[in-house]
Interface confidence: low
């Protein structure tokens, strides 16, 4: 067969869907690989073909679109399951072609089971809410395109296993769930179940997401360097080990890249000939404020090393700070000769 532009298996889009629920899967070619959309391709006489490879099989086979009640169908660039079955799991390929052009991509589809409390192997999206920040909402995700706007579904919200009703600060409002004032106690998994009718059948869509309550931007500050500071002097003799911790507190900031680094005489440690190692550790508070510690270590410090400038730098979206460590060479204690007889005793 003639050559086909094969984009391979697109593992970036590991699609997971629940068993016994409708699923609509768009061919990724038009979303991520080609510069034109399905309508343009269709008007140009290109045909979209679907096939799949079952789990633990190597054989590509056509998708059976003649199942009872049109359980699997294709509409434009969307593959529909109404509903899915466990053994629909596999790698699906969509191929766009005519006599002179061919392009295809495969993607994995995993049909997963859930228990009565909505626990499953599904990877959950995380929605962050700011602590004590006023009314914030989450929206039932990925339900667009399943039913027309004329259909009014029923939506039930759950926290963990429990239906949300008469909760103090959490109010279901259709597709939205409103948090009047988010607190740490609101951390957890929230599930919306959308129920809608179609052609005399009732379908359910289950969507679970994790809510994480994080530090509010109202309280955010630039990075704070706790160490080094003016109260601690790193006084060493040549040959001793020099250990200087740089400990920095970062307020939680959405999408901020927190950075800590050392410079030695204005250069990065890697560009200095001395044998220096840097070890980093990171810890988080319950609201995802971050404390980063980078320990600069020189195993056997020289008198030259003790004259260098050691500066800890930190940066977040709130600003950049730097602090020099106070490093000095230990002065040997003066040696006193004590003559015990001098001025004491009998004459």
């Amino acid at each position: 067969s003639e050559r086909c532009d094969d984009w391979g298996l697109d593992t970036m889009r590991q699609i997971q869907v629940f068993e016994d629920e409708p699923a609509r899967i768009k061919c990724p070619l038009f979303e991520h690989f080609l510069k034109f959309n399905y309508s343009t391709a269709h008007s140009a006489g290109l045909t979209l073909i679907w096939y799949w490879t079952r789990q633990d099989r190597d054989l590509e086979e056509p998708i059976n679109f003649r199942l009872p009640e049109n359980r699997i169908s294709k509409e434009k660039d969307v593959l529909w399951f109404r509903p899915t079955l466990l053994n629909d799991t596999g790698n699906y390929t969509c191929m766009l072609r005519n006599t002179t052009y061919c392009s295809k991509v495969a993607f994995p589809l995993e049909v997963v089971q859930k228990d009565s409390c909505f626990n499953s192997p599904m990877k959950l999206p995380v929605h962050k809410l700011y602590i004590e920040y006023g009314i914030q909402r989450i929206t039932c995700p990925n339900v667009d395109g399943y039913f027309p706007s004329s259909v009014k579904p029923t939506i039930t919200w759950y926290m963990g296993c429990y239906k949300i009703q008469n909760f103090n600060n959490v109010i279901p409002e259709g597709m939205n769930l409103s948090f009047l004032i988010a607190l740490i106690s609101n951390n957890g998994n929230y599930t919306c179940v959308v129920t809608y009718p179609e052609n005399g059948r009732t379908f359910h869509l289950t969507r679970t997401l994790t809510v994480k309550v994080v530090g509010s931007p109202k309280n955010a500050v630039p990075p704070v360097i706790h160490s080094p500071n003016d109260h601690v002097v790193y006084e060493k003799e040549p040959g001793e080990e020099l250990l200087i911790p740089c400990t920095v507190y970062f307020s939680f900031l959405m999408d901020s890249r927190n950075e800590v680094w050392w410079t030695i005489d204005g250069k990065k440690p890697d560009d200095i000939t001395i044998d220096v190692t840097i070890n980093e550790s990171i810890s988080h508070s319950r609201t995802e404020d971050e404390t980063r510690t980078q320990i600069l270590s020189i195993k056997k410090v020289t008198s030259e090393d003790l004259k260098r400038s050691y500066v800890c730098h930190a940066r977040s979206a709130k600003g950049e700070v730097a602090k020099a460590a106070k490093v000095k060479q230990k002065v040997p204690a003066p040696r006193y000769t004590v003559e015990l007889a001098c001025g004491f005793g009998a004459t």
Epitope: V260, W261, D270, H313, R315
Partner: antibody, heavy 124, light 107 residues
Amino acid sequence: QVQLVESGGGVVQPGRSLRISCAASGFTFRSYGMHWVRQAPGKGLEWVAIIWHDESYKYYVDSVKGRFTISRDNSKNTLYLQMNSLRAEDTAVYYCARGDYYGSGSYYDAFDIWGQGTMVTVSS
Amino acid sequence: DIQMTQSPSSLSASVGDRVIITCRASQGISNYLAWFQQKPGKCPNLLIYAASTLRSGVPSRFSGSGSGTDFTLTISSLQPEDVATYYCQKYNSAPYTFGQGTKVEIK
């Protein structure tokens, strides 16, 4: 001294694959993000891909997404670019460049060390 | 994605002239901008990073300025060895886009 040396370029037919390499020496390779940049004959520089020091993050320019894969072997001090489904427009000199120093973020992000480049020609 | 637009695309100046190349980002990039020099048949060479920090070993006739969206590279007194193509590049986040280049020649 600090050095990057690319290899593996050559002439390849459209639709075929090629893997190019970049050997690093003279610095702590495992501490740096690394990049691939390309330059088509007579054209400007085009950034292609980045990989963080520990492979935890990779990103590609749109024109190669899904076709090219950047990887590294820190034990061998080597950066790779696997190029699949090659097209005529991928013809270029491919350079590897040293990126940010781990722990510093963007402070040292500028591409301070470059290799001499390896030529990849896609032609039938 | 953020676009980087350089101007002019080429220029011709006499030895000793002051040369100014501009680079504009389609969105603000703070000071995450680098300038490179590329001589024919050679790999690019970093001149300036963080918009205005001169890389060690680069002659002081090169300088950079700007922040946000508008940046300039200035060669205070053009020398014959400065004949090259100059590129700006943003590096605040991927994709790390380059400008289209400015070719500098001697009159």
